[in-house]
């Protein structure tokens, strides 16, 4: 209209999706009577009547706003509920009297996008790619208006960089009118990026101001060629025979190349390939001294067939050889002396110890054990232990049995055995001496002899209990070149009154556990039946 003043800028009303917009008609009393107002929405420069106010009473017009409009503030404000992105437009109120004036309101709608969803390239990126490769994608769903995306690497924003960094973004409009932003980061990566942390950030605006949401941080699988190959041995430190040793090949490339482990043959000086397990690890179990030697690893890039060799690594499996004792089977007269000498080889310095077998008592620290004025009790086992003090658990031992010449010793001199008439009795008798004795019985029966050790013998006799046997008892006699000795077994009939509830009526004599060095009057460790009651 000629001469009409330029329209003032509309009032800005900002509101979040889903909430209520309060559209206040800003007409002054001079411009119009608020009890008689028409409200319009303007879309693509087309006005549509949406609401009428007459005498302060409101009435919605049929259409998209019919159910969402109401009057507030004594008719000065129009409330629009459940705001959607499609409501972002100009609304105007027009007063009818005294003359037609209008007031314009620009409704701005906002919605925060969902948390950005980042997905990393699941196949990884080679460092030698010819152009920027897809690193990760970022999706920000259901925002309004379109959020802005910023990509970060190690906390620093990434900028477009020709042939190095390219960010490609697009948006789609959902049926709700909200935007989904999709962005893909393409970059040329270097080996150092294997640990780089990438994330995307969405920047958006709300009525309350500017905001941002960050995705989780991701690392990208980066592929780079192997430059260095090396061997690693577990366990670290000194190795000993019997250990489980693992030799593995390591490389600084990703993915790891194909490996083979070789050992230098000491005679030919040629490298011979060793058999590794499925993981490419050479397992030596148990490790032996023959495993000592020079190992190296070869790595192949199967694409280029270029191979790399590791620095050789010397492996030392420490050992102690079999221990030798001389004399190996010593025999001595009572009162004489004996020198026992122990020898062994090792990859390390050795320490020797002599121990008494029966008691584990340390007799000597050193390879030589001197024994003087030998008594019969000195017979038995002596153990030489050769050990490497610097490697706990690395030791070998050798046992030597010293025999002292002497007539037989009996495990017991006499013993009472409870029997029942007509039972088959199992009797045993033990004796020791050097030379080893033989045992004979003074009654007929089935006898069997068992050698317990070079100086000790156990004889067992099965015999039927007869009245004569009860009368005479049983004797066992042990004899060798140097003499003889006898043990007596007295047989006593078992009365019912002599039995206790837990006693065994068929008990014979259990094998004595007395050692060859036990005195003849030593107590037996077998369970004895109670003494018979006295009969008056």
């Amino acid at each position: 209209v000629p001469g009409e003043a330029e329209q003032p800028a509309p009032e800005l009303v900002e509101v979040e999706v889903g909430s209520t917009a309060l559209l206040k008609c800003g007409l002054s009393q001079s411009q119009g009577n608020l009890s008689h107002v028409d409200w319009f929405s303007v879309h693509k420069e087309k006005r549509t009547l949406i609401f009428r106010v007459r005498q302060g009473q409101g009435q919605s017009e049929p259409g998209e706003y019919e159910q969402r409009l109401s009057l507030q503030d004594r008719g000065a404000t129009l409330a629009l509920t459940q705001v959607t992105p499609q409501d972002e437009r100009i609304f105007l109120c027009q007063g009818k009297r005294p003359r037609s004036q209008e007031y314009r309101i620009q409704l701005r709608v906002y919605k925060a996008p969902e948390e950005p969803n980042i997905q990393v390239n699941p196949l990884g990126i080679p460092v030698n790619s010819k152009e920027p490769e897809e690193v990760a994608t970022c999706v920000g769903r259901n925002g309004y208006p379109i959020p802005q995306v910023i990509w970060y690497k190690n906390g620093r924003p990434l900028k477009e960089e020709k042939n190095r960094v390219h960010i490609q973004s697009s948006q789609t409009v959902e049926s709700s009118g909200l935007y989904t932003l999709q962005s893909i980061l393409k970059a040329q990566l270097v080996k150092e990026d294997k640990d780089a942390q990438f994330y995307c950030e969405l920047n958006y605006r709300l009525p309350s101001g500017n905001h941002m949401k960050e995705s989780r941080e991701v690392t990208v699988p980066v592929f780079y060629p192997t430059e260095k190959v090396w061997l690693e041995v577990e366990p670290v430190g000194m190795l000993k025979e019997g250990d489980r040793v693992e030799i593995r090949c390591l490389a600084d490339g990703n993915p790891p190349p194909h490996f083979s482990i070789s050992k230098q043959n000491p005679s030919t000086r040629e490298a011979e390939e060793e058999t590794t397990n499925d993981n490419g690890v050479l397992v030596l179990e148990p490790a032996r001294k023959e495993h000592s030697g020079r190992y190296e690893c070869q790595a192949w890039n199967l694409d280029t067939m270029i191979s790399l060799l590791s620095e050789p690594q010397e492996l030392l499996v420490n050992y102690v050889s079999d221990v030798r004792v001389s004399p190996a089977a010593p025999e001595r007269q009572e009162g004489s002396s004996l020198t026992l000498t122990c020898e062994a080889e090792s990859s390390q310095d050795l320490e020797f110890q002599w121990l008494r077998e029966e008691t584990d008592q340390v007799l000597e620290r050193g390879p030589v054990l001197q024994l003087h004025d030998l008594k019969r009790e000195a017979g038995g086992g002596y153990r030489c232990v050769a050990s490497v003090p610097s490697i706990p658990g690395l030791n070998r031992t050798q046992l030597v049995k010293l025999a002292i010449f002497g007539p037989p010793w009996m495990a017991f001199k006499e013993r009472k055995v409870w029997v029942k008439e007509n039972m088959v009795l199992n009797l045993s008798c033990e004796a020791s001496g050097h030379p080893r004795p033989t045992i004979s019985w003074n009654v007929n029966g089935t006898a069997s002899e068992q050698d317990q050790d070079p100086q000790r013998v156990l004889s067992t006799l099965n015999v039927l209990v007869t009245p004569e046997l009860l009368e005479t008892g049983v004797e066992c006699t042990a004899s060798n070149d140097l003499g003889k000795n006898t043990s007596i077994l007295f047989l006593e009939l078992v009365n019912l009154t002599t039995l206790t509830p837990d006693s065994n009526t068929t008990t014979g004599l259990s094998t004595s556990t007395a050692s060859p060095h036990t005195r003849a009057n030593s107590t037996s460790t077998e369970r004895k039946l109670p003494e018979p009651e006295s009969r008056g």
Epitope: Q119, P122, L123, S129, E131, T137, Q182, I184, K186, R216
Partner: antibody, heavy 118, light 106 residues
Framework: QVTLKESGPVLVKPTETLTLTCTVS????????VSWVRQPPGKALEWIAA???????YYNSAFKSRLSISRDTSKSQVVLTMTNMDPVDTATYYC????????????WGQGTLVTVSS | DIQMTQSPSSLSASVGDRVTINCKAS??????LAWYQQKPGKAPKVLIF???SLQTGIPSRFSGSGSGTDFTLTISSLQPEDFATYYC????????FGQGTKLEIK
Amino acid sequence: QVTLKESGPVLVKPTETLTLTCTVSGFSLTSNGVSWVRQPPGKALEWIAAISSGGTTYYNSAFKSRLSISRDTSKSQVVLTMTNMDPVDTATYYCARRYGYGWYFDFWGQGTLVTVSS
Amino acid sequence: DIQMTQSPSSLSASVGDRVTINCKASQNIYNSLAWYQQKPGKAPKVLIFNANSLQTGIPSRFSGSGSGTDFTLTISSLQPEDFATYYCQQFYSGYTFGQGTKLEIK
């Protein structure tokens, strides 16, 4: 619209080499990566190989030494070769487009059944 | 390699039923998971990506949920055309598919 179509022999002999071609239309191979996925009769899907929009090639490590994937952008074709074929390689072979802003497959070819038999 | 295990391997249901199919990853894959539908003699078709986003053109009766190692595909009200085999696929590290769940008419 986006289409992918596999072509190649339906029958190969053991120890022979299989060559399959995937011809695409409706998109550019420099915008979307393409993968090959196979499915033995009555079995599950198995990813074989991929070529990215930038031309980087990727292989399933189970077949790596037998596979080669390449592309001819001017012909809109992706070629898969698989050497030393075995009867266990009998399957329907699909080529599939990787979605431009994600890592899943949004369009697939109809597949081609390859039988390995002497 | 990441293993994907689907359960059940087969399932009988009727039109109108609500159906859930589960997929378990052998390690955390965040939400790097897609669901596909395959009918006999046809190529797979993507239904869900990023664990819970519905692919354009797929009916809203299909929905996906879960993150980390446990995921679910739900069909809220089975339609006759939904009887097919369903596969989950991870794209967190390489690509691996589940063994499939065959959905049959009861």
